[in-house]
């Protein structure tokens, strides 16, 4: 009888999922550029200042930094130009460019944003002669919302982009923590799914009963992530075990005080090319 693979596909899946914080911080499908422009999405209320950060990969001897907005016809409208701590005269004073002390980061701020400031923004750098070079940053989106009277429950704009080293640290630590937590969780799940490992008995032909709520117990909501359909890749066909559980395993992740979400089916093999969670994927591994 061939040996079962046990939890290894799950462990591997967890390690893959451990990279998610990195994806969330910086989407890999944004091509690398000598210029970065962050945050990729910024929301402010009208009247507030909206600040993007344009960062140069290195600091050339002489360069001009331009700040653009994409027009409805997809043309770049220049908002401000900056060189050697000088901003071009005669421009709209609402558009400010400030060089930060590290020399390579620039704050590009719209003072008292208006609703019609919503749109796509980017920065561009011209490295001056003798080595003339023109670079453009990825685009970023600004949404200016109408001012509401009640204070917002969440801060209106995402925090500024983390610096490279700090970002790496956050990704690493978060990945390890998420990995460890999920390993513990999956160990518990495995113990429940393969009870013979703990009880020495074979329980076949029945699924776990759904969680029952006692009359005086606090309500427990389940977030059901549906079936994880593992496609086992056996090198040699295995004779059917007389008492082997079905190759479909169910994982129920329990969060107290949360409404249940509909189940979702995912194949474990599809995790191999895992992508960052798309907006419609909801909160992913973390409760909202």
């Amino acid at each position: 009888m061939g040996s079962r693979r046990g939890p290894w596909p799950l462990v591997w899946a967890v390690l893959q999922l451990g990279w998610w914080p990195g994806w969330l911080l910086d989407s890999p499908d944004r091509p690398w550029s000598p210029l970065t422009f962050s945050p990729a999405q910024l929301t402010v209320q009208e009247g507030e200042n909206a600040t993007f950060t344009c960062s140069l990969a290195d600091i050339p001897d002489s360069f001009v930094l331009n700040w653009y907005r994409l027009s409805p016809r997809n043309q770049t409208d220049k908002l401000a130009a900056f060189q050697e701590d000088r901003i071009e005269p005669g421009r709209d004073r609402r558009f400010r460019v400030t060089r930060l002390p590290n020399g390579r980061d620039f704050h590009m701020s719209i003072v008292a944003a208006r609703l019609n400031d919503s749109g796509i923004y980017l920065c561009g750098a011209i490295y001056l002669p003798p080595n003339t070079q023109i670079n453009e940053s990825p685009r970023a989106e600004l949404s200016v919302t109408e001012r509401t009277l009640e204070p917002p429950t969440q801060s209106p704009s995402p925090p500024p982009r983390l610096s490279g080293q700090l970002q790496g640290l956050v990704i690493g630590v978060t990945s390890v923590l998420v990995g460890v937590l999920l390993l513990l969780l999956l160990t518990w799940v495995l113990a429940a799914v393969f009870p013979r490992a703990t009880r020495g008995a074979c329980v076949c032909g029945s699924e776990d009963e759904p969680l029952k709520e006692g009359p005086d117990a606090a309500p427990v909501f389940t977030l059901d992530y549906g079936e994880l359909d593992f496609q086992w890749r056996e090198k040699t066909p295995e004779p059917p075990a007389p008492c082997a559980p079905e190759q479909t395993e169910y994982a129920t992740i329990v969060f107290p005080g949360r409404p249940a979400s509909p189940g979702r089916r995912a194949s474990a093999s599809s995790l191999q090319g895992a992508q960052p969670p798309s907006p419609e994927d909801g909160p992913g591994l973390w409760p909202p």
Epitope: V64, K78, E84, R86, L128, T132
Partner: antibody, heavy 117, light 112 residues
Amino acid sequence: DLTLQESGPGLVKPSQTLSLTCVVSGGSVTNIFYWNWIRQRPNRGLEWMGYWSGYTHYNPAFQGRISIDADTAQNHFSLQLSSMTTEDTAVYYCLRGYIWTPDYDYWGQGILVTVSS
Amino acid sequence: DIVMTQTPLSLSVSPGEPASIACKASQSLLHSNGNTYLYWFRQKPGQSPQRLIYKVSNRDPGVPDRFSGSGSGTDFTLRITRVEADDAGVYYCGQGIQDPWTFGAGTKVGLK
């Protein structure tokens, strides 16, 4: 290599409007750069008039009678100077700068415009 | 506007001899960022002006090291260590610290 070539009338009557065009070849007229007009009056120095860079910025000495525009599709930019007087007789240069200050890297050959009745 | 005053207005030099042109600004061209925005241009007969020096002392690509710029604040000098026939023309100083950008009246350099 980038070349700039001014074109327009060599003779303008007083009170008329001067229209000059600068055709750019070997490169694009885009708002990345600063597309300037400078003039040189007889026995005088150089006089910066203004630039286009997606928007315009003018020397206050010409404010109210100057207009600089660009046609990025036709790859040229233009100067209009109204209410011409004999004092506006000069060689007019179009030029490109990579910043707004006098960091000009390409100049046209210049065109002599005489204001006379 | 900042007024740029050049002296002398004309200069006649023998080939191989040095030459210097002075330029005085009506106010300091030193910016708070530490840069001084003073430029030198040369216009050869029948040609457009070309920049030689930027920010007081930086030579543009292709400019021979016979040309050097110096000075600070309001007073600046362009020096040619050994004048050659090709150096004939009108030399202009210009400022880029305050809009509008202004230029000197020019110094005509001729060869004896």
